[in-house]
């Protein structure tokens, strides 16, 4: 018969012959022949391959280096890589999460719109009119100005985006 020029899914062409790829979690030891199936071997401890493949070496699991602020979020298997995340208060510098940086704090006048996670930094927003933040924080949202009226008080000093209003007693009308 004519040698094939293309192979089915999960096969590869070598020396005019279609051989089965190795399944995820296994590496190629020996190509198939007319007489013998593809020879594959499981990846070793701390190794993985996540696709149907013809790799002769498995990939090493990612190392979550604590010196870089990393910790294991999900342990790798023979078919998946280790997933790293950052220690509390830190977040990844990239999608690959190869190192961590301290979460950003929102300066006075800015509040936390979204609290940081292991993979994303703090998102700050300017405090709108009627709100303020007087601290540098990675958790505090903008707080609403105090409502003097509800306390039967009057505004003695207007609030800003960094300060609350100052309330005081209402001036009594003299007789």
């Amino acid at each position: 018969p004519e040698p094939p020029t293309a192979c089915r899914e999960k096969q590869y062409l070598i020396n005019s012959q279609c051989c089965s790829l190795c399944q995820p979690g296994q590496k190629l030891v020996s190509d198939c022949t007319e007489f013998t199936e593809t020879e594959c071997l499981p990846c070793g401890e701390s190794e993985f391959l996540d696709t149907w493949n013809r790799e002769t070496h498995c990939h090493q699991h990612k190392y979550c280096d604590p010196n870089l602020g990393l910790r294991v979020q999900q342990k790798g298997t023979s078919e998946t890589d280790t997933i790293c995340t950052c220690e509390e208060g830190w977040h990844c510098t990239s999608e690959a999460c190869e190192s961590c940086v301290l979460h950003r704090s929102c300066s006075p006048g800015f509040g936390v719109k979204q609290i940081a996670t292991g993979v994303s930094d703090t998102i700050c927003e300017p405090c709108p009119v009627g709100f303020f933040s007087n601290v540098s924080s990675a958790f505090e949202k903008c707080h609403p100005w105090t409502s003097c009226e509800t306390k039967d008080l009057v505004v003695q000093q207007a609030g800003t985006n960094k300060t609350d209003v100052v309330c005081g007693p209402q001036d009594r009308l003299r007789a």
Partner: antibody, heavy 117, light 109 residues
């Protein structure tokens, strides 16, 4: 460990038959093609026959074609060589060997076949 | 049929010396399918080299293979006492038959 053990050799008269066996262990026998290779006393290696893992492909050396039959029983992890119409020139040590794209990577210890009247 | 011719028939050398064995094919052989075997008296052959130049598992690095087309070489860089044996080349690219060379005997001088 990975092992091949041949048996069934012996002394036989010309024209008679003999069946050799090769018992495999330590690997997935049903995934590998298997060969028979022989070596006459004081001579070199001569390839005899091959069978594919699913037994659908079989090839023979011209010197044994029509007389020898290679077969296998994957449920018993065993390879066979049925030898009919034996001749003096078939006298040899018969080895079974595992097929890979790297060559014959595992060999048995061999079994001696002597064809003599 | 591809005929493999090995030379010399016998090689007489001392331990520590370099051995160079030749295997010549009657027509071009894909180097992916050229192997070398070692056989000691009373033992089965053992795979040494496959794909013309790749060492089989557990084979010391003093054994090396080279060549392409019709000319192939097995080199033993420094002969150890256990290396004195018969060496066969084999092609398994073009079959049937899978052919072996006639062998080279490496003996102690």
């Amino acid at each position: 460990q990975v092992q091949l053990v041949e048996s069934g050799g012996g002394v036989v008269q010309p024209g008679r038959s003999l069946r050799l066996s090769c018992a495999a262990s330590g690997f997935t026998f049903s995934s590998y093609g298997m060969h028979w290779v022989r070596q006459a006393p004081g001579k070199g290696l001569e390839w005899v026959a091959v069978i594919s893992y699913h037994a659908s492909s079989k090839y023979y050396a011209d010197s044994v074609k029509g007389r020898f039959t290679i077969s296998r029983d994957n449920s018993k992890n065993t390879l066979y060589l049925q030898m009919n119409s034996l001749r003096a020139e078939d006298t040899a040590v018969y080895y079974c060997a595992r097929d890979t794209s790297r060559g014959h990577d595992i060999w048995g210890q061999g079994t001696m076949v002597t064809v003599s009247s | 049929e591809i005929v493999l011719t090995q030379s010399p028939g016998t090689l007489s050398l001392s331990p520590g010396e370099r051995a160079t064995l030749s295997c010549r094919a009657s027509q071009s052989v894909s180097s992916s399918y050229l192997a070398w075997y070692q056989q000691k008296p009373g033992q089965a052959p053992r795979l040494l080299i496959y794909g013309a130049s790749s060492r089989a598992t557990g084979i010391p690095d003093r054994f090396s293979g080279s060549g392409s087309g019709t000319d192939f070489t097995l080199t033993i860089s420094r002969l150890e006492p256990e290396d004195f044996a018969v060496y066969y080349c084999q092609q398994y690219a073009d079959y049937p038959p899978f052919t072996f060379g006639g062998g080279t005997k490496v003996e102690i001088k």
